[in-house]
Amino acid sequence: HTAAQDNCTCPTNKMTVCSPDGPGGRCQCRALGSGMAVDCSTLTSKCLLLKARMSAPKNARTLVRPSEHALVDNDGLYDPDCDPEGRFKARQCNQTSVCWCVNSVGVRRTDKGDLSLRCDELVRTHHILIDLRHRPTAGAFNHSDLDAELRRLFRERYRLHPKFVAAVHYEQPTIQIELRQNTSQKAAGDVDIGDAAYYFERDIKGESLFQGRGGLDLRVRGEPLQVERTLIYYLDEIPPKFSMKRLT
């Protein structure tokens, strides 16, 4: 990778081990936990990142800082099974043979069952709503400036094309970023909205996944945009299948 011709590191994923053992002595990086080769010009899949996070030695792991506002997927962190492309396998099981089905962002979408549970396909999360509340500012941000800045951020930092940022809504102090992406809309090289949302979530929490890059410094016309809470909602192409018991 150019990634770091000189010191051989992965700019888009610090949870990697890199060495100049690629073709022609080029830098090649592998994700911790899975050992899978990653492309350091783009985001690493959320599945491989979760796997790396779970495999990191306890004392080196950067745990999520507990916060009453932080919404983790209700089941919290787990060590996922990833397919050869780094995507979540449709069925996930823990060490005690409890299994469940997940969507493309790794969030549970069925009740938990046993090893007989079948998950026929990986259901795509095609709509992600990122709900942010920003800290008080002197005045409200200009909506169009905010929209432009967030689109620029998602393109430059997360490599997500603006076509997938469906809308930016703003009613001070709440900002909502809508990401939409059907399977058929993704062209070669397009970043997955689930991966972009995960990198953004980690950036907002001050747990950047980028190597040696400063933390997220969001500014709208020079005014700092500081987020005090984040909620992320995932909508799947096929609605989830939970029993009525859970819904009550």
């Epitope: 990778h1 150019t2 990634a3 011709q5 700019p11 010009s41 783009t42 689109r151 620029r152 393109r155 430059e156 490599r159 094309h161 603006p162 076509k163 059907n182 058929s184 809309q185 993704k186 062209a187 070669a188 090289g189 397009d190 970043v191």
Partner: antibody, heavy 119, light 108 residues
Framework: QVQLVQSGAEVKKPGASVKVSCKAS????????MHWVRQAPGQGLEWMGE????????SYNQKFKGRVTITRDTSTSTAYMELSSLRSEDTAVYYC????????????WGQGTLVTVSS | DIQMTQSPSSLSASVGDRVTITCRAS??????LNWYQQKPGKAPKLLIY???RLHSGVPSRFSGSGSGTDFTLTISSLQPEDFATYFC??????????FGQGTKLEIK
């Protein structure tokens, strides 16, 4: 192998419109971005706009202020670029080029279509 | 828009020479820099993408380096077929994607 074949040269009068076609083969048309780039005689390259053939999403270089329209026909794996209100400065070779979503590199190009605008 | 500036705008060299062309971006573009070769009357051809990755079929005498705002295309040993015009292009930010003005490489 990947091929992009463009329509032939055109001569147009100022104020008219031109529509250039680009037929793709050798790959799945809907799986790659398609871009249009032009080059005036003896000049550099200028990006005009892009389309995702799968859903028809487009974005354009604001320089062209609504004069450019990019469309596609997935049944024939063909992309089109229409430029309206032509002026003499639009005389150029127009290229279609297949693009990558992350690098935004143009890995395969059409042979080019010369559009001459002259009264 | 991000401006891309190439230097030199033209240069003369001989077969076997080592040649370097530089490209400077008006702001940080990380590594999202691509290089193209164009011969008279022909369409451009992609040589290098993402600063240093060789496009398929491109000879290994071509190499690229750089990061941020300053980038370099190097031809280690010029061959007769390398005399052409070279363009850099950034794919970092929101459209429009921009090209350098070109560097014409001529036979000395």
């Amino acid at each position: 192998q990947v091929q992009l074949v463009q329509s032939g040269a055109e001569v147009k009068k100022p104020g008219a419109s031109v529509k250039v076609s680009c037929k793709a083969s050798g790959y799945t048309f809907t799986s790659y971005w398609m871009h249009w780039v032009r080059q005036a005689p003896g000049q550099g390259l200028e990006w005009m706009g892009e389309i995702t053939p799968s859903d028809g999403y487009t974005s354009y270089n604001q320089k062209f202020k609504g004069r450019v329209t990019i469309t596609r026909d997935t049944s024939t794996s063909t992309a089109y670029m229409e430029l309206s209100s032509l002026r003499s400065e639009d005389t150029a070779v127009y290229y279609c080029a297949r693009g990558h979503g992350n690098y935004v590199s143009f890995d395969y190009w059409g042979q080019g279509t010369l559009v001459t605008v002259s009264s | 828009d991000i401006q891309m500036t190439q230097s030199p705008s033209s240069l003369s060299a001989s077969v076997g020479d080592r040649v370097t062309i530089t490209c400077r971006a008006s702001q940080d573009i990380s590594n999202y820099l691509n290089w193209y070769q164009q011969k008279p009357g022909k369409a451009p051809k992609l040589l290098i993408y993402y600063t240093s990755r060789l496009h398929s079929g491109v000879p290994s005498r071509f190499s690229g380096s750089g990061s941020g705002t300053d980038f370099t295309l190097t031809i280690s040993s010029l061959q007769p077929e390398d005399f052409a015009t070279y363009f850099c292009q950034q794919g970092y930010t929101l459209p429009p994607y921009t090209f350098g003005q070109g560097t014409k490489l001529e036979i000395k």
